[in-house]
């Protein structure tokens, strides 16, 4: 049978097994989600993209799944990230009371996975899936992350933190999920401030990256939305993590502040 050839890699091998196993594990680790029926979650996930043309997926397609995965993060505990996922996850694994999207059920299920189906067949396409740039933006994976990222930002409250990669040419990138979705969906009536943590890459890098033009652009966008903005440099990410693990260490002074400058804007 003829199958459309897309430019992106195909569905992750053993996708259904992985999603179901992750769901079961998540509900075991998080007792507050014990009520979740993982078979229903998988059925809703599958229903969002199976038998549908993979360049015509909508946020509406994912609503049944979003409904099943409803979760709230306590105020001041949301951690967004852009182009620095691994460090963000290492941080929340230590700082257990803060949460990235991938620490929530739906983000956890889909992290690092690719998936797509085909129009009018019940098959999962393991050969190829649409690439965001080369094929289309309304593909199953991109629409999923846009949907859950929007919801994650909308439900955030208090002081929201974001980890940004100081090694990138655009520390804040308007085209990233953070820049194009999350920033615009923070609710000013619930979010008092956004605090950016700019992570330095080089050992000897002592520049104040909070003065970077793209950070100024982020500050402008946030301020216009009536949300206060703060920025901190984290010069030594390894030291930063170490101090989160062992805050009483004498070299850490007052918690995380030892490893970065603090800028109020």
């Amino acid at each position: 049978r003829w199958r459309q050839q897309w430019s992106g890699s195909g569905t992750t091998s053993r996708f259904p097994e992985t999603v179901l196993a992750r769901c079961v594990k998540y509900t075991e680790v998080h007792p507050e989600m014990r009520h979740v029926d993982c078979q229903s979650v998988w059925d809703a996930f599958k229903g969002a993209f199976i038998s549908k043309y993979p360049c015509n997926i909508t946020e509406e397609d994912y609503q049944p799944l979003v409904k099943l995965g409803t979760q709230t993060v306590p105020c001041n505990k949301t951690l967004l990230w852009s182009r620095i996922k691994d460090l963000a996850h290492q941080f929340t694994q230590v700082q257990r009371d803060m949460f990235t999207l991938e620490d929530m059920l739906l983000g956890y299920l889909a992290d690092d996975l690719t998936w797509c189906g085909e129009f009018n067949t019940f098959e999962i396409n393991y050969q190829s899936c649409p690439d965001w740039r080369k094929d289309c933006s309304n593909n199953p994976v991109s629409v999923f992350w846009k949907t859950v990222s929007r919801r994650f930002a909308e439900t955030a409250c208090g002081v929201v933190h974001v980890m940004l990669n100081g090694s990138r040419s655009k520390i804040f990138d308007k085209n990233s999920t953070f820049g194009s979705v999350e920033v615009h969906n923070l609710q000013p009536e619930k979010v008092q401030a956004l605090e950016a943590w700019v992570i330095h890459g080089g050992r000897e890098d002592s520049r104040d990256l909070c003065q970077d033009p793209t950070i100024k652009e982020l500050e402008s966008i946030i301020s216009k939305r009536n949300i206060r903005f703060f920025c901190k440099n984290i010069y030594r990410p390894d030291k930063f993590l170490q101090c989160v693990k062992n805050p009483e260490d004498s070299s850490c002074l007052s918690g995380i502040s030892a490893s970065h400058h603090h800028h109020h804007h």
């Epitope: 091998s13 053993r14 259904p16 097994e17 992985t18 196993a21 075991e28 690092d112």
Partner: antibody, heavy 117, light 107 residues
């Protein structure tokens, strides 16, 4: 306390069948993912199959897919592995294991399956 | 499938020594990794889950660390009863895959 006891192993000729059982006690059998893991003589551990708590989802390693069937009887608190078309390379100690939080937290003592003519 | 590579494949150490075993994943697996101990003729036993959480009843000399692709099992003061083969296991992407094992012998 949690206990898993396998049975049903033995010597069998290539191409023949065998059914392994794993009797579970000390926990609610229907609330956990149950797995079979095997270990060939002198070799490492290899995952074989899983059945999720409600029995509606069963998954297999490529090496046994189409030949082995995992099943469970919640009323008997027993896990099964039906092994058909056995091959010499299926010779191993077969363990049943309970999965909790992504880890095999309890294992049976194992049952040896020898496929030989 | 994700490949898990353990090193060393075997080691010999004295009672009281600090022993370190590493496990490297062929791709990032977050902290979805466990460590198991297996003695000859016995079933494996869970020591560490979620990369660093000590399983109930396991002596505190065992500890796990790491995230992403590189993980470590440390035995802080080796005891005679720690003579065994140790395996890592990932469950990040199905199916679960084990490392090839590290045999620890007492000098």
């Amino acid at each position: 306390q949690v206990q898993l006891v396998e049975s049903g192993g033995g010597v069998v000729q290539p191409g023949r069948s065998l059914r392994l059982s794993c009797a579970a006690s000390g926990f609610t059998f229907s609330s956990y993912g149950m797995h079979w893991v095997r270990q060939a003589p002198g070799k490492g551990l290899e995952w074989v199959a899983v059945i999720w708590y409600d029995g509606s989802n069963k998954y297999y390693a490529d090496s046994v897919k189409g030949r082995f069937t995992i099943s469970g009887d919640n009323s008997k608190n027993t896990l099964y592995l039906q092994m058909n078309s056995l091959r010499a390379e299926d010779t191993a100690v077969y363990y049943c294991a309970r999965m909790f939080r992504g880890a095999f937290d309890y294992w049976g003592q194992g049952t040896l399956v020898t496929v030989s003519s | 499938a994700i490949q898990m590579t353990q090193s060393p494949s075997s080691l010999s150490a004295s009672v009281g020594d600090r022993v370190t075993i590493t496990c490297r994943a062929s791709q990032g697996i977050r902290n979805d990794l466990g460590w198991y101990q297996q003695k000859p003729g016995k079933a494996p036993k869970l020591l560490i889950y979620a990369a660093s959480s000590l399983q109930s009843g396991v002596p505190s000399r065992f500890s796990g660390s790491g995230s992403g692709t590189d993980f470590t099992l440390t035995i802080s003061g080796l005891q005679p009863e720690d003579s065994a083969t140790y395996y890592c296991l990932q469950d990040y992407i199905y199916y679960p895959t084990f490392g090839q094992g590290t045999k620890v012998e007492i000098k």
